[in-house]
């Protein structure tokens, strides 16, 4: 392990499309990858009229946008599908939306997923 880096060995797995994709719906996913690549966890979700619908959660491979993020936070302003990634075992269990806006003060919207 590299000092200051949180190694990701497993992530929470969820797939809303599990029947079509022929996967489990939920579980824990071991993260594999080349030794020289960093591994992350991710979450994608939708906000349908204020109701959170998780799309996918799992492992995500070496992505500079995820480096050194201990929390899974979406910072884009009002995307159609929300995405966040992080480093550390099961760091995608909780995810949040914290848009970076220039004028107004951002507000945190933490989400504790409760898959159906």
């Amino acid at each position: 392990a590299i000092l200051g880096r949180s190694e990701t060995q497993e992530c929470l797995f969820f797939n809303a499309n599990w029947e079509k994709d022929r996967t489990n719906q939920t579980g824990v996913e071991p993260c594999y990858g080349d030794k020289d690549k960093r591994r992350h966890c991710f979450a994608t979700w939708k906000n349908i009229s204020g109701s959170i619908e998780i799309v996918k959660q799992g492992c995500w491979l070496d992505d500079i946008n995820c480096y050194d993020r201990t929390d899974c936070v979406e910072k884009k302003d009002s995307p159609e599908v929300y995405f966040c990634c992080c480093e550390g075992n099961m760091c995608n269990e909780k995810f949040s939306y914290f848009p970076e806006m220039e004028v107004t003060q951002p507000t945190s919207n933490p989400v504790t997923p409760k898959p159906p």
Epitope: N17, K20, D21, E29, T44, G58, W60, V81, F83
Partner: antibody, heavy 120, light 107 residues
């Protein structure tokens, strides 16, 4: 060095069968999902089938569902594609390709391909 | 199935030119977008994954951008070895689908 080597292609008559193999080396085969992608002469790329690291999950393109079967033998570091009821439109170069996870499917290494020709 | 539309289907450019290829998905695919380079008679090679991440061994003149439905592959200064066909591919859901390809030719 990661290497993927396909074999088993050739000329077959419509309605016939072929089994393609992909021998993998240079990485821990049993930790990776694997895929078959094909390319008809002069055309673009078409994903055919995928299988996760332990063979628990398999998926197919609609165009081959019910005719093709993907499998793997982790003890032999080999991926297979059993192709039955072959049609002229199955004529293509077939590539095997590696992906790290079942859902984050970018294909980071590809074999050189094997040509399948379906013709009478 | 998610449809991937690439434009242009072909382009002519000179060495040193900045080249931009676009890819549009029929629905949001977040950042599940990959780019491949293929030369005649050869297997495709991964160039960009997760919309913006450079694959191992790929020169830094290649870059990717976009999220949601619209994505771009940019070659900042075209080199002789970059003349090839480029494909985008979504991995948001199965079946995996590819764009129709963009052939980059010498002007």
């Amino acid at each position: 060095e990661v290497q993927l080597l396909e074999s088993g292609g050739g000329l077959v008559q419509p309605g016939g069968s072929l089994r393609l193999s992909c021998a993998a080396s240079g990485f821990t085969f049993s930790s990776y999902s694997m895929n078959w992608v094909r390319q008809a002469p002069g055309k673009g790329l078409e994903w055919v089938s995928g299988i996760n690291y332990n063979g628990g999950y398999k998926s197919y393109a609609d165009s081959v569902k019910g005719r093709f079967t993907i499998s793997r033998d982790n003890s032999k570091n080999t991926l297979y594609l059993q192709m039955n009821s072959l049609r002229a439109e199955d004529t293509a170069v077939y590539y095997c390709a590696r992906s790290a996870t079942w859902h984050d499917t970018h294909l980071d290494y590809w074999g050189q391909g094997t040509l399948v020709t379906v013709s009478s | 199935d998610i449809q991937m539309t690439q434009s242009p289907s072909s382009l002519s450019a000179s060495v040193g030119d900045r080249v931009t290829i676009t890819c549009r998905a029929s629905q949001s695919i977040v950042r599940y977008l990959n780019w491949y380079q293929q030369k005649p008679g050869k297997a495709p090679k991964l160039v960009i994954y997760a919309a913006t991440s450079l694959a191992s061994g790929v020169p830094s003149r290649f870059s990717g951008s976009g999220s949601g439905t619209d994505f771009t592959l940019t070659i900042s200064s075209l080199q002789p070895e970059d003349f090839a066909t480029y494909y985008c591919q979504q991995s948001y859901e199965l079946p995996l689908t590819f764009g129709g390809g963009t052939k980059v030719e010498i002007k």
